[in-house]
């Protein structure tokens, strides 16, 4: 048994990493492996995380992980049975990869303008709940071609459009997902999408 | 909302013990390590150890080794710290405080004063 | 006796920019990642900047830090009267840190 990808955490910079990687062929992750960390500290203890199949030769772990802060760095130990497959390292502050928004929802009550708001993923205390940014995207469920992205650049998890911006009398999809600059991570995954049907009235032509 | 709440000012005698508690709330215990440090009269702050509420394991500063002990209660979620063979010199303010960076809060500190 | 020296004592008029430095070695500040602490009058210490230059969420952006080597420096903008408080850098001490450390403190006095 051989570790064919090399296990690649990323971090939530909350209370999870999770840790992917490939094996040379099909293997029982939960019952053939077992991936053990150590927070490299003081009085630290260490933990098994028993990976999950994420197809055929994938594994997954989801690491519990406390009190993240930037010096943090785990030594990571892949075990099947007694033989130690692979000896790594992880760093979670260069490695983050913010949770994904929730509770989004469109308001179609303000005078001609849609108002999406969400949720910050994380609670004020977390460094991240100030650093968030967002990607918001629109699409019609009639037209694959009327896609669009909204910037999100301030710290309010919300934004506004005039709905006259979107096709009138038809359905639209909405989903947001955020990044932070501050500890260059990737983008989270999207938040679950939401529908809402848009309309307004149309201005009067003048003649 | 994070509390840290401190048992109450003792007036100790030269060569006593005294044992300080901290209970914690609005957070989960045994995910933050406790510090305790501690302020003299008009002096700075300084650290004493900390403890690590998940197996109870703790790492003292060398000055105080020998002499400190620090303990948790996972069921109420308190933290100790003893201190014994007091002299004048340990008259402070006792703070203890979570997480591996001293987050806030912190508690209020509880005052020892030792006095013949 | 700490090994992270500060200055005793700073002082500035309101609105006026403030820097405390805290000198160390490359067992401490330059192996390590430095907070700084505001102790108002009479009352416990308060987390201001950790990691060299985040702020916990409540401390206004008046409030920074850097590092740089083997010291570090938190500077403070716009002085209030509400800022004249003592100042304490800490980090953790020894490879592997062992030991937390603060540094001798400094008082702060707005004029």
């Known amino acids: 048994m051989k570790v064919l990808q090399e296990p690649t955490c990323v971090s939530d910079y909350m209370s999870i990493s999770t840790c992917e990687w490939k094996m040379n062929g099909p293997t029982n992750c939960s019952t053939e492996l077992r991936l053990l960390y150590q927070l490299v500290f003081l009085l630290s203890e260490a933990h098994t995380c028993i990976p999950e199949n994420n197809g055929g030769a994938g594994c997954v772990c989801h690491l519990l992980m406390d009190d993240v802060v930037s010096a943090d760095n785990y030594t990571l130990d892949l075990w099947a049975g007694q033989q130690l497959l692979w000896k790594g390292s992880f760093k979670p502050s260069e490695h983050v990869k913010p949770r994904a928004p929730g509770n989004l929802t469109v308001h179609t009550n303000v005078s001609d303008t849609l108002l999406l708001t969400w949720s910050n993923p994380y609670p004020p205390d977390n460094y991240l709940y100030n650093h968030l940014t967002y990607a918001v995207n629109i699409w019609s469920e009639n037209d694959p071609a009327d896609f669009r992205i909204y910037n999100v650049t301030y710290l309010e998890p919300s934004l506004r459009i005039a709905a006259s911006t979107l096709k009138s009398g038809i359905s639209y999809r909405a989903r947001v997902r955020a990044w932070a600059q501050c500890y260059n991570t990737t983008w989270s995954e999207w938040s679950p999408s939401t529908k809402w049907h848009n309309s307004y009235r149309e201005p009067f032509e003048q003649h | 909302q994070v509390q840290l709440v401190q048992s109450g000012a003792e007036v100790k005698k030269p060569g006593a013990s005294v044992k300080v508690s901290c209970k914690a709330s609005?957070?989960?215990?045994?995910?933050?390590?406790m510090h305790w440090a501690r302020q003299a009269p008009g002096q700075g702050l300084e650290w004493m150890g900390i403890i690590n509420p998940s197996g109870g394991s703790t790492s003292y500063a060398q000055k105080f080794q020998g002499r400190v002990t620090m303990t948790r209660d996972t069921s109420t979620s308190t933290v100790y710290m003893e201190l014994s063979s007091l002299r004048s010199e340990d008259t402070a303010v006792y703070y203890c405080a979570r997480g591996k960076l001293l987050k806030n809060p912190w508690g209020k500190g509880t005052l020892v004063t030792v006095s013949s | 006796q700490s090994v992270l020296t500060q200055p005793p004592s700073v002082s500035a008029a309101p609105g006026q920019k403030v820097t405390i430095s805290c000198s160390g070695g490359?067992?401490?500040?330059?192996?390590?990642?430095v907070s700084w602490y505001q102790q108002l009058p009479g009352t416990a210490p308060k987390l201001l900047i950790y990691?060299?230059?985040k702020r916990p969420s409540g401390i206004p952006d008046r409030f920074s830090g850097s590092k740089s080597g083997t010291s570090a420096t938190l500077a403070i903008t716009g002085l209030q009267t509400g800022d004249e408080a003592d100042y304490y850098c800490g980090t953790w001490f020894g490879t592997p840190a062992s030991n937390y450390v603060f540094g001798t403190g400094t008082k702060l006095t707005v004029l």
């Open positions: 609005g957070y989960a215990f045994t995910s933050y390590y």
């Open positions: 490359s067992s401490n500040i330059g192996n390590s990642y």
């Open positions: 990691d060299n230059n």
